[in-house]
Each structure stands twice: as structure tokens, then as C-alpha cells.
């Protein structure tokens, strides 16, 4: 049976100072050069060792970078974006998406929002009546002390 | 990949007029330039045109004779030159901004970062 992958997708501010070896990663993508099918946008397809990203550590591999200083990454060729990063200065403000996968299991067998296919709250009702018995439990040898 | 692809050049009698057109591709929204090399001299700049074409700048040897333009949606630039002269005679290099949309044009070499192969002009 085949699997559906979801993601979860979230949007970071991360402000980089550049360092001997650039911003620390390389870059794929373009209007002449797409990466992702009908998407023409700019992904990060390497972090350097112990460069500038990897140092800071929030930008990742695969991650998505939606403007640069503020200049938007929407249509643009590739080497033109490459020289964006190249001119953006010493200190340097991305705008990133990160793409989270959050599921990957058969379909028909899932619940909305849980990695593990059971509904979360076939899960949490069990957890918590076992706890409050738990409780009552101990109250009552307590009090028989 | 970036390529500029010179164009238009060739043999012209004195007060003659040639235009230069410069194909450009991998690159756009640059500052654009013409520089021009005659032999046995160092390369100078000619004119420069920025990336929306609403400011250009000229070398005081060619001002009046040269216009600088260009087809934004041809990602092309163009030399329209006039009234040519001996001393014109060089080999013409078109050249783009190393800086995607950089505000300021100027006739710097290290300002331009992609060149094209250039264009025999011959003046007799």
C-alpha cells in the first residue's frame, strides 16, 4: 500500500555574518534551472562544514530561501540569485522555509495529525484514566498509613 | 550559464555609423557596459547603461557620436555609434555587472564580471 508524506511548513528569519568561505552553502534552483517541479524558487542543496550555516545551524539542507535583505528570490535566474548572495554584504538576513516531514504511513489507516496512525485521543483517554486510578490508589494507602 | 554574444561590428569608411548589439543570456537586470580594446592598448570603457535603462554614462571622447540603449525584454544591449573615426577602431567587448540590479553604473572594469568573446570594429 503506498504511503502519504505531509510536511509541515514553517518560515524562519536567520541572520548570517559572513565568513572567510561566504555564507557557508550552496544553492540550486532558478527560473533556467528549477530543483522542484513547477517551482522556479531557490533551495539549499549543500551546508559547508564549519562554515558560516552550519555554524549558526538553522538553515538546512533542502530548505527554501524566500528573500535575501529583504529582495525577494521569486523568478529569478539562476546565476542571478547566486550573485545576490555574493553582493548581500557582511551581515545577511535570509528569509527561509523549512519543510518538516510529519508523516509517512499507509493510507486509510491514519489519524489526522498523528505519526503513528491511531487517533491521539484513543491514545490520551487510556494514559489518563490509568493515571487518575494510579492516584486514587496511592491516596487511599496513604491514608491507611 | 552566462554568455554575452557580440554582434554588428566591421569594416566602415570614416563618418560612417555601426551599431553593436549584445545578446545576453543566464544573467538579467544588470548594469551593462561597453569597453573597447585597440591594439597594443589597455582595454577602456566606452559607455554604460543601468539594468532599467533610465541612466547611462558616456566617455568624453565619444559623447554626442554614441548612444548606449537597451530591450529589457531582449535581454539585449545596444552601441549605436556615428560619425566614426580612425581612432575608434578596436576590438568592442560588451560586459554586465557582477551585482544583480546594482544601483550605481560606472566605467570600472572590476564592476563587471561577465564579458563577451567582442566584435571587430574597423574604422578606415
Known amino acids: 500500500m503506498n504511503g502519504r508524506v505531509d510536511y509541515l511548513v514553517t518560515e524562519e528569519e536567520i541572520n548570517l555574518t559572513r565568513g572567510p568561505s561566504g555564507l557557508g552553502f550552496n544553492i540550486v534552483g532558478g527560473t533556467d534551472q528549477q530543483y522542484v517541479s513547477n517551482d522556479s524558487g531557490i533551495y539549499v542543496s549543500r551546508i559547508k562544514e564549519n562554515g558560516a550555516a552550519a555554524l549558526d545551524g538553522r538553515l538546512q539542507e533542502g530548505d527554501k530561501i524566500l528573500s535575501v535583505n529583504g529582495q525577494d528570490l521569486k523568478n529569478l535566474l539562476h546565476q542571478d540569485a547566486v550573485d545576490l548572495f555574493r553582493n548581500a554584504g557582511y551581515a545577511v538576513s535570509l528569509r527561509v522555509q523549512h519543510r518538516l516531514q510529519v508523516q509517512n504511513g499507509p493510507i486509510g489507516h491514519r489519524g489526522e495529525g498523528d505519526p503513528s496512525g491511531i487517533p491521539i485521543f484513543m491514545v490520551l483517554v487510556p494514559v489518563f484514566a490509568l493515571t487518575m486510578v494510579a492516584a486514587w490508589a496511592f491516596m487511599r494507602y496513604r491514608q491507611q498509613l | 550559464q552566462v554568455q554575452l554574444v557580440e554582434s554588428g561590428g566591421g569594416l566602415v569608411q570614416a563618418g560612417g555609423s555601426l551599431r553593436l548589439s549584445c545578446a545576453v543570456s543566464?544573467?538579467?537586470?544588470?548594469?551593462m557596459g561597453w569597453f573597447r580594446q585597440a591594439p597594443g592598448k589597455e582595454r577602456e570603457f566606452v559607455a554604460a547603461?543601468?539594468?532599467?535603462?533610465?541612466?547611462?554614462v558616456y566617455v568624453d571622447s565619444v559623447k554626442g557620436r554614441v548612444t548606449i540603449s537597451r530591450d529589457n525584454a531582449k535581454n539585449t544591449v545596444y552601441l549605436e555609434m556615428n560619425s566614426l573615426k580612425p581612432e575608434d577602431t578596436a576590438v568592442y567587448y560588451c560586459?554586465?555587472?557582477?551585482?544583480?540590479?546594482?544601483?550605481?553604473?560606472?566605467?570600472?572594469?572590476?564592476?563587471?564580471?561577465?564579458w563577451g568573446q567582442g566584435t571587430q570594429v574597423t574604422v578606415s
Open positions: 560586459a554586465a555587472d557582477g551585482r544583480f540590479r546594482a544601483g550605481q553604473i560606472g566605467p570600472s572594469l572590476g564592476l563587471y564580471h561577465y
Open positions: 543566464g544573467v538579467s537586470f544588470r548594469n
Open positions: 547603461i543601468s539594468w532599467s535603462g533610465d541612466s547611462t
